[in-house]
């Protein structure tokens, strides 16, 4: 909501999760792994990489089925704590200028830092208008104090807020699982909020920094390297 059409393939780590329709976003973090939101879990997912217009075949797409879908063991569907999911692709993505991985964070998100949020979610705060072309939004990371004041009792240490307390610009339904990137690092995953782009109700995002070890351990545990002697 309140964003702009991204320059074509300018967000090369952005993926669309498809189950016959686009239902969530995600981020490519290696040639065979995607990170998304825990609440985006489905038993069958097709990962669509290199997308810009999700309704048109433009020639840069790679459609790869999910081989493994691993939700965080402490995901809580009521509170959306630990709202993170890993998808192993059935075959590695072909990395190129339009499809490439985003780095995991080396430090937690800092208040005031500019970030890029992207997705194919609803662009209206009231009503529905789902875009075909990838939308981008530049937004600042808010302080934890501002975040907690916006959602008293709802914000855990695994969440942070990004956006504008005055409203008007925000992620929305269909953006879940997608990236929040600051300084070339995946800091957040689109998670939840009360409505979209409402005053004093900024978007809430999963704090990826808290899950770097889990991500690395999970990838290692699910990568089968065969050693020949």
């Amino acid at each position: 909501v309140g964003g702009y059409i991204c320059e074509e393939n300018s967000v090369p780590y952005q993926v669309s999760l498809n189950s016959g329709y686009h239902f969530c976003g995600g981020s490519l973090i290696s040639e065979q792994w995607v990170v998304s939101a825990g609440h985006c879990y489905k038993s069958r997912i097709q990962v669509r990489l290199g997308e810009h217009n999700i309704e048109v075949l433009e020639g840069n797409e790679q459609f790869i089925n999910a081989a493994k879908i691993i939700r965080h063991p402490k995901y809580n569907s009521r509170t959306l704590d630990n709202d993170i999911l890993l998808i192993k692709l059935s075959s590695p993505a072909v990395i190129n200028s339009r499809v490439s991985a985003i780095s995991l964070p080396t430090a937690p998100p800092a208040a005031g830092t500019e970030s890029l949020i992207s997705g194919w979610g609803n662009t209206l705060s009231s009503g529905a208008d789902y875009p075909d072309e990838l939308q981008c939004l530049d937004a600042p990371v808010l302080s934890q104090a501002e975040c907690e004041a916006s959602y008293p009792g709802k914000i855990t240490n695994n969440m942070f807020c990004v956006g504008f307390l005055e409203g008007g610009k925000d992620s929305c339904q269909g953006d879940a699982g997608g990236p929040v990137v600051s300084n070339g690092e995946l800091q957040g995953i689109v998670s939840w909020g009360y409505g979209c782009a409402q005053k004093n109700r900024p978007g809430v995002y999963t704090k990826v920094y808290n899950y770097v070890d889990w991500i690395k351990d999970t990838i290692a545990a699910n990568s089968h390297h065969h050693h020949h002697h």
Epitope: C24, H39, S77, L80, Q173, A176, W192
Partner: antibody
Framework: QVQLVQSGAEVKKPGASVKVSCKAS????????ISWVRQAPGQGLEWMGW????????NYAQKLQGRVTMTTDTSTSTAYMELRSLRSDDTAVYYC??????????????????WGQGTTVTVSS | DIQMTQSPSSVSASVGDRVTITCRAS??????LAWYQQKPGKAPKLLIY???SLQSGVPSRFSGSGSGTDFTLTISSLQPEDFATYYC?????????FGGGTKVEIK
């Protein structure tokens, strides 16, 4: 395989209540929602309400507000629909149906991919 | 509430015919529409979801199209087992609403 199995037919008197059960199997119950739909004899489909199996959030059809309650028991993967103050025009086949969970900022889509076999409820004095 | 208007209410056709059923929403629902088939005494069965996606196991002679307010279900070559009642359903928002149904009968 994925299936929803409903409780048996009921005959009730006007003013009474009925509680229909819907037991799910073949999938993780809390990853989906359940809708309830009814069909009066010779009529079309009427949506009654929806319940999230993971959060127990509900949304009821306006005309049934105050008379209907939908619940779930995650320990037995069972959904329930209770309808009170029954009238003769509540005579219908009642269906439960599985739909996508709608949580957070995922795309909200309220289709129904798996249906129970139906429970006939007859209200007659 | 979003009203769903289906037409025709009934259609007589022969095996092998192409049958088209339309559904109109009273306001825009993007692609959030489903189509169901129901046979007498049976529960509805999902055919098409998100306006044009074919449900697993459903024959490819069924197809759906449309976006916004106008949607179509097409059966390219009617088979004996396709004689049934078809319903559209808006899957965009609460309250969920169905079309009135289209009965496909043998000519």
């Amino acid at each position: 395989q994925v299936q929803l199995v409903q409780s048996g037919a009921e005959v009730k008197k006007p003013g009474a209540s009925v509680k229909v059960s819907c037991k799910a199997s073949g999938y993780t119950f809390t990853d989906y929602a359940i809708s309830w739909v009814r069909q009066a004899p010779g009529q079309g489909l009427e949506w009654m309400g929806w319940i999230s199996a993971s959060t127990a959030d509900t949304n009821y059809a306006q005309k049934l507000q105050g008379r209907v309650t939908m619940t779930t028991d995650t320990s037995t993967s069972t959904a329930y629909m209770e309808l009170r103050s029954l009238r003769s025009d509540d005579t219908a086949v009642y269906y439960c149906a599985r739909g996508d969970e709608v949580v957070g900022k995922m795309t909200y889509y309220y289709g129904m991919d798996v249906w129970g076999q139906g429970t006939t409820v007859t209200v007659s004095s | 509430d979003i009203q769903m208007t289906q037409s025709p209410s009934s259609v007589s056709a022969s095996v092998g015919d192409r049958v088209t059923i339309t559904c109109r929403a009273s306001q825009g629902i993007s692609r959030w529409l489903a189509w169901y088939q129901q046979k007498p005494g049976k529960a509805p069965k999902l055919l098409i979801y998100a306006a044009s996606s074919l449900q697993s196991g459903v024959p490819s002679r069924f197809s759906g199209s449309g976006s916004g307010t106008d949607f179509t279900l097409t059966i390219s070559s009617l088979q004996p087992e396709d004689f049934a009642t078809y319903y559209c359903q808006q899957a965009n928002s609460f309250p969920i609403t169905f079309g009135g149904g289209t009965k496909v009968e043998i000519k």
